[in-house]
């Protein structure tokens, strides 16, 4: 015998109190699959959360974070404070990036400026708290009389990583 509840579509529940009739989900509840015996309570996006998508009879509400915060985790389970560019979030709140580091986003940590010399290049534009340095051509390319044509790259010996 087929379970009569299996005929109940999403947005309804199988009401045992009414001879297993498919009843619509009550307000502020939903069922996202058929054959449900109960409807789930809709998530409420309050406080630090705000509603990104309203709850419907077939799908839960979706939250994001109020301005000044950003979502963490699947389904925006928590919110983390935003900082300004050029800052990072510490245990004592937002702090400016230390000299030699930058953060170009409202979240995340300050990262060290690129070391241009490791790539044999010079610094074209200095770094700031908000921006990484911009590396330019190698110092040799900038010397007077240097050819503007880039010479072919020398063949690398096996086992050596590129410069």
């Amino acid at each position: 015998l087929q379970d009569p509840c299996s005929n109940c579509p999403a947005g309804t529940f199988c009401d045992n109190n009414r001879n297993q009739i498919c009843s619509p989900c009550p307000p502020n509840s939903f069922s996202s699959a058929g054959g449900q015996r109960t409807c789930d309570i809709c998530r409420q996006c309050k406080g630090v959360f705000r509603t990104r998508k309203e709850c419907s009879s077939t799908s839960n509400a979706e939250c994001d974070c109020t301005p000044g915060f950003h979502c963490l985790g699947a389904g925006c389970s928590m919110c983390e404070q935003d900082c300004k560019q050029g800052q990072e979030l510490t245990k004592k709140g937002c702090k400016d990036c230390c000299f030699g580091t930058f953060n170009d986003q409202k979240r995340g940590i300050c990262r060290p400026w690129t070391n241009c010399s490791l790539d044999g290049k010079s610094v074209l534009v200095n770094g700031t708290k908000e921006r990484d340095v911009v590396c330019g051509p190698s110092p040799a390319d900038l010397s007077p009389g240097a050819s503007s044509v880039t010479p072919p790259a020398p063949a690398r010996e096996p086992g050596h990583s590129p410069q």
Partner: nanobody, 128 residues
Framework: EVQLVESGGGLVQPGGSLRLSCAAS????????MGWVRQAPGKGREFVSA????????YYADSVKGRFTISRDNSKNTLYLQMNSLRAEDTAVYYC?????????????????????WGQGTQVTVSS
């Protein structure tokens, strides 16, 4: 055994100040996001403020922003709520709550279902 014990409530005149404390025990305090929730007579719960496990992220309800300050001392396993410029509408029972999850050291939540543990509450009455 997990315990959250609030203290510091009382009767205060409008414009006055109080500092609530919540002493926690029985869990790794710094791993838990903490919150202060209040309930006035005949009204629903209102999330007043929340703070992440490491203390970097704080949230305040619009109704208390600029007047209340949440803080925590992880070395003392204690949560605080400094309440200044108190108003009659701040009269309520204040509860502290603790919840943990993957991001609770750096994030906050104002969803009551996130919080695993609740204190018994402390009464704050603002009246002249």
């Amino acid at each position: 055994e997990v315990q959250l014990v609030e203290s510091g409530g009382g009767l205060v005149q409008p414009g006055g100040s109080l500092r609530l404390s919540c002493a926690a025990s029985g869990f790794t305090f710094s791993s838990y996001a903490m919150g202060w929730v209040r309930q006035a007579p005949g009204k629903g719960r209102e999330f007043v403020s929340a703070i992440s496990g490491y203390g970097g992220t704080t949230y305040y309800a619009d109704s208390v922003k600029g007047r209340f300050t949440i803080s925590r001392d992880n070395s003392k396993n204690t949560l605080y709520l400094q309440m200044n410029s108190l108003r009659a509408e701040d009269t309520a029972v204040y509860y502290c709550a603790a919840g943990t999850g993957y991001y609770s050291r750096v994030g906050v939540s104002t969803d009551p279902s996130f919080y695993d543990y609740w204190g018994q509450g402390t009464q704050v009455t603002v009246s002249s």
